[in-house]
């Protein structure tokens, strides 16, 4: 009862963080104009993975999508290629743990299978869980590097009588949606993987046999002799699981222009 | 076809209030922020401040904070602007102006003349 | 607050001539996000209100004759007139459309010969 419930969660919270992954992704407020120790502007910049965006103070938006990909910064480039990786090996790992559930039955599946595809989607959701973390992360530190730059530029090159509004940007709302489900995605995973143990049958104890020999009446059970003679029940129905090896690229900030209102 | 409708001229002494209004029509009233702009004689255009109908979220010019309030009511789509404690220096036309795409004011009432005189 | 400059605070023309009018503010109005300079130009003639005739520094309003120009980028703004007209005698206003407070320049007004 106890697997099931784990196994159920597991899924949930999974699902939950790869909608979470998925929302994060196509959402533009990945950027966002600082608007502290700034002149108050009538015009709010912010940025996504995809698009750019302007507010008007009037109320009008205006979104323009980033139609090239060559002239796109290389680490935007890893960020959205993380997100993906993320998204697809999550959806796959749904796909996978839905199968693997211990409260839906189909054909005659045994329990070694859905251990087997409970461990997999787990594996599958920890990796997506990772991808989306590192790539937040990374978007994260190309807009500090990016910020702490621009303030350099607001205190040097000020000797000329015009003045320029020096926009700079700050996390967006979409990156704590990023951290957030990423964070559930693999505590999912993790869950999966705990209940993968408990799907797995530990023993299968045959019943005693009764064998009688002319004259006696003994009764001899296989399973007695299990430690000397190697017979009876002492096979357990157990695997051996290779998660499989997974690497991650190193990743460094890129300086990426941003906008204020 | 989108009109600004102001009310008309007022005479009024130092230290006394006034408040003005300005009806819209033709357009969604709660879908854009109506502006208000001050013109004293001859001279120039000074931004008061505007406010959004829908939230009623007002943006007012430092200037004229403590001096001008703007409140909308929506079930007539019309804006007002009360002034206080008027001075001579608050002698002008005062417009309100629709605020259009790119923070501009798109279209303008016809403009109410306050003339402040003891 | 950023100051709008206009040039010249008058002119006089003859119908059918070329005029152009300056705008200088003393803060940049390009937007790096939208690549767009929030600078608006207005006419107003005598015993009227303001009637919007650019905005974006370049993009002309719906219904303005195509005489009717906007240039310029940063804080050097122009205003073109290629054939003026006798219906074009107003005082003309530049504003800032970027930074609060909105700013409006003094204006340059428009006479004929």
């Known amino acids: 009862m106890a697997v099931t419930a784990c196994q159920g969660l597991g899924f949930v919270v999974s699902l939950i963080g790869i909608a979470g992954i998925i929302a994060a992704t196509c959402m533009d407020q990945w950027s966002t104009q600082d608007l502290y120790n700034n002149p108050v502007t009538a015009v709010f910049n912010y940025q996504g993975l995809w698009r750019s965006c302007v507010r008007e103070s009037s109320g009008f938006t205006e979104c323009r999508g980033y139609f090239t990909l060559l002239g796109l910064p290389a680490m935007l480039q890893a960020v959205r290629a993380l997100m993906i990786v993320g998204i697809v090996l999550g959806a796959i790992g749904l796909l996978v743990s839905i199968f693997a559930l211990k409260c839906i039955r189909i054909g005659s599946m045994e329990d070694s299978a859905k251990a087997n595809m409970t461990l997999t989607s787990g594996i599958m959701f920890i990796v997506s869980g990772l991808c989306a973390i590192a790539g937040v992360s990374v978007f994260a530190n190309m807009l500090v590097t990016n910020f702490w730059m621009s303030t350099a530029n607001m205190y040097t090159g000020m000797g000329g009588m015009v003045q320029t509004v020096q926009t700079r940007y700050t996390f967006g709302a979409a990156l704590f949606v990023g951290w957030v489900a990423g964070g559930l995605t693999l505590i999912g995973g993790v869950m999966m993987c705990i209940a993968c143990r408990g799907l797995a049958p530990e023993e299968t104890n045959y019943k005693a046999v009764s064998y009688h020999a002319s004259g006696h009446s003994v009764a001899y059970k296989p399973g007695g002799f299990k430690a000397s003679t190697g017979f009876g029940s002492n096979t357990k129905n157990k695997k051996i699981y290779d998660g499989g090896a997974r690497t991650e690229d190193e990743v460094q900030s890129y300086p990426s222009k941003h906008d204020y209102v | 076809e989108v009109q600004l409708q102001q009310s008309g001229p007022e005479l009024e002494k130092p230290g006394a209030s006034v408040k003005i209004s300005c009806k819209a029509s033709?357009?969604?009233?709660?879908?854009?922020?109506m502006n208000w702009v001050k013109q004293s004689n001859g001279k120039s255009l000074e931004w008061i401040g505007n406010i959004d109908p829908y939230y009623g979220g007002t943006t007012y010019n430092q200037k004229f904070k403590g001096k001008a309030t703007l409140t909308v009511d929506k079930s007539s789509s019309t804006a007002y602007m009360q002034l206080k404690s008027l001075t001579s220096e608050d002698s002008a036309v005062y417009y309100c102006?629709?605020?259009?795409?790119?923070?501009?004011?798109?279209?303008w009432g016809q403009g109410t003349s306050v003339t402040v005189s003891s | 607050d950023i100051v709008m400059t206009q040039s010249p605070s008058s002119l006089t023309v003859t119908a059918g001539e070329k005029v152009t009018m300056s705008c200088k503010s003393s803060q940049s109005l390009l937007n790096s996000g939208n690549q767009k300079n929030y600078l608006t130009w207005y006419q107003q003639r005598p015993g009227q209100p303001p009637k919007l005739l650019i905005y974006?520094?370049?993009t002309r309003e719906s219904g303005v004759p195509v005489r009717f120009t906007g240039s310029g980028s940063g804080t050097d703004f122009t205003l073109t007139i290629s054939s003026v007209q006798a219906e074009d005698l107003a005082v003309y206003y530049c504003q800032n459309a970027y930074i609060y407070p909105l700013t409006f320049g003094t204006g340059t007004k428009l006479e004929l010969k």
């Open positions: 102006a629709r605020y259009g795409k790119g923070n501009t004011m798109d279209y």
């Open positions: 033709g357009y969604s009233f709660t879908g854009y922020k």
């Open positions: 974006w520094a370049s």
